[in-house]
Amino acid sequence: QRLSRAQQQLPLESLGWDIAELQLNHTGPQQDPRLYWQGGPALGRSFLRGPELDKGQLRIRRDGIYMVHIQVTLAICSSTSTSRHHHPTTLAVGICSPASRSISLLRLSFHQGCTIASQRLTPLARGDTLCTNLTGTLLPSRNTDETFFGVQWVRP
Amino acid sequence: QRLSRAQQQLPLESLGWDIAELQLNHTGPQQDPRLYWQGGPALGRSFLRGPELDKGQLRIRRDGIYMVHIQVTLAICSSTSTSRHHHPTTLAVGICSPASRSISLLRLSFHQGCTIASQRLTPLARGDTLCTNLTGTLLPSRNTDETFFGVQWVRP
Amino acid sequence: QRLSRAQQQLPLESLGWDIAELQLNHTGPQQDPRLYWQGGPALGRSFLRGPELDKGQLRIRRDGIYMVHIQVTLAICSSTSTSRHHHPTTLAVGICSPASRSISLLRLSFHQGCTIASQRLTPLARGDTLCTNLTGTLLPSRNTDETFFGVQWVRP
């Protein structure tokens, strides 16, 4: 996919630069496995520059390939607490709307650990809303250095 | 934060490109939990292009949003050696100076694992010094494919 | 390393933008610990824009510093299955050809976990072929949200 002549001549900012780093706000009500995020300078070191939040979920505003990254730490956790459960606690990041584009992008289980962290490159389109689903009964830490979620536009 | 007209017209290199990937040099003396890093082509695949080292700690020379990443592997490690300790071995990356900006950016515990790896986006300012604190008595591996620490400027 | 005048004046695409995100195709035959990758829009969300595949291994076509990232999840896995083995299952990413540049770039062991994920910055040269070696008897998951491997050109 080559840059159009217009893109080549526009100032650099028009090429993208869309970026966000979010901190955990709260978990969902029962039966809602989603994590709800927040961001902005008033909250500390989180920010949204391009993407936006829709009821705590991250919505993409520019087409492109993005680096998506996440770290989630369980709040009250030991190796035994994660392994004791029949179903290991699992974190999945996916496109949850529009429904026609719904797909899981990134999935990790905690097993005997208390933190998961990963990243991946993926194409995203304007309007895609990313949801982060945490299954299981364990609560995530709200510490901003332990639980965070971000995206970075890297190319058209 | 939009690019100024001057920034739009300057060559790309003036926008940033600051980047570093470091390898472990040594751990600190007793009571100093910091890891001391080194970088440069003579050492292998590590490098500093913009940021600099100050007594083994990474100092930022350009304001912007950075992708910070780290991997630390414990040198002599089994699931039992990490779980046997009352206090799990923990790795924290933070701004340690100037003191007015001191904050923890990224924190992970090893629990029953022998490697931690993560990354995050964070705003950093010229003069910020990043420290990586490893608490506990376990030694990190000095292998360059197992323990490394890096930053990449991604936007103003 | 400063950009040449020619590079400054060329359209942005000429500076790099090389990027790939791959999904697992299959494992190697006995005595071959390599994972074999595939990519392309017909396969889902994987893609190759610049780098190319050579018999399932990723070959770099442009010099530069790259962010390399990987996640591998073991297919039939519990904490006991990874810890039961005398030798923990290990994943290594390295340059495997040309032989003169052979080196391990990134290595992780599973220990009591079922997923490893990490990333690093590293200089790569045109013609470098990256191999991902999974030692041990456990099989990786082929789910595209659990096992993936990618590179992103970040600067000259």
């Epitope: - | 040594h26 751990t27 592997t73 414990l74 040198a75 002599i76 490690c77 022998c114 376990l138 030694l139 591996s141 000095r142 292998n143 197992e146 | 005595q31 610990p33 005398h86 030798h87 923990p88 299952t89 290990t90 994943l91 290594a92 052979s102 391990s104 290595r107 062991s109 070696n133 030692t135 041990g136």
Partner: antibody
Framework: QMQLQESGPGLVKPSQTLSLTCTVS??????????WSWIRQHPGKGLEWIGY???????SYNPSLKSRLTMSVDTSKNQFSLKLSSVTAADTAVYYC????????????WGQGTLVTVSS | DIQMTQSPSSLSASLGDRVTITCRAS??????FNWYQQKPGKAPKVLIF???SLQSGVPSRFGGSGSGTDFTLTISSLQPEDFATYYC?????????FGQGTKVEVK
């Protein structure tokens, strides 16, 4: 419990090549977490690390011996080997094979050692 | 290369004695440092790793300390099976190097 066993000729003539093999039992040499080393001990003297090999064939040699040294691995036989060329009487020693961790050079398993004498 | 210098090269001691062996590295090796015991006709055996960690199965009368360039192996109360030669080794950088050994003999 893993075992390592050295084998090879006990007598080598000067200027010839010393060849030894180490067979690993009760454990696979194809492991991402170990290096396989050779260490020697001259009669009545200390220990000298010769070099290591990884299952993939990558090696690291002691610079003092590098020009004469070749190590190889045969994963199908669970063996690794040492060849030291142009030997002299100064290469007379007990040669040990040993295992160390990839992440930390601690030699936790050793063969029983084999004495190699260089003499005409 | 990092040179490892042990002292003394030999010592005579009696059962129950407290024995101390030192090892000095030519440059800092942090705590990437180990101690081994070797008996005649046998391969060396790990006693201490990472400067002060006791290898599994090794009696608690053995102890290690130090970091940087100066390290100590202590046997708190010498037992009959402790008469042997002791070697230090650095794991900081290749080539891995050993000390020349300290022989502990019966007084």
């Amino acid at each position: 419990q893993m075992q390592l066993q050295e084998s090879g000729p006990g007598l080598v003539k000067p200027s010839q090549t010393l060849s030894l093999t180490c067979t690993v039992s009760d454990g696979s040499i194809i492991s991402g977490v170990y290096y396989w080393s050779w260490i020697r001990q001259h009669p009545g003297k200390g220990l000298e690390w010769i070099g290591y090999i990884y299952y993939s064939g990558s090696t690291s040699y002691n610079p003092s011996l590098k020009s004469r040294l070749t190590m190889s691995v045969d994963t199908s036989k669970n063996q690794f080997s040492l060849k030291l060329s142009s030997v002299t009487a100064a290469d007379t020693a007990v040669y040990y094979c040993a295992r160390s961790g990839y992440s930390y050079a601690l030699f936790d398993y050793w063969g029983q050692g084999t004495l190699v004498t260089v003499s005409s | 290369d990092i040179q490892m210098t042990q002292s003394p090269s030999s010592l005579s001691a009696s059962l129950g004695d407290r024995v101390t062996i030192t090892c000095r590295a030519s440059q800092s090796v942090d705590r990437y440092f180990n101690w081994y015991q070797q008996k005649p006709g046998k391969a060396p055996k790990v006693l201490i790793f990472a400067a002060s960690s006791l290898q599994s199965g090794v009696p608690s009368r053995f102890g290690g300390s130090g970091s940087g360039t100066d390290f100590t192996l202590t046997i708190s109360s010498l037992q009959p099976e402790d008469f042997a030669t002791y070697y230090c080794q650095q794991s900081y950088s290749t080539p891995w190097t050993f000390g020349q050994g300290t022989k502990v003999e019966v007084k």
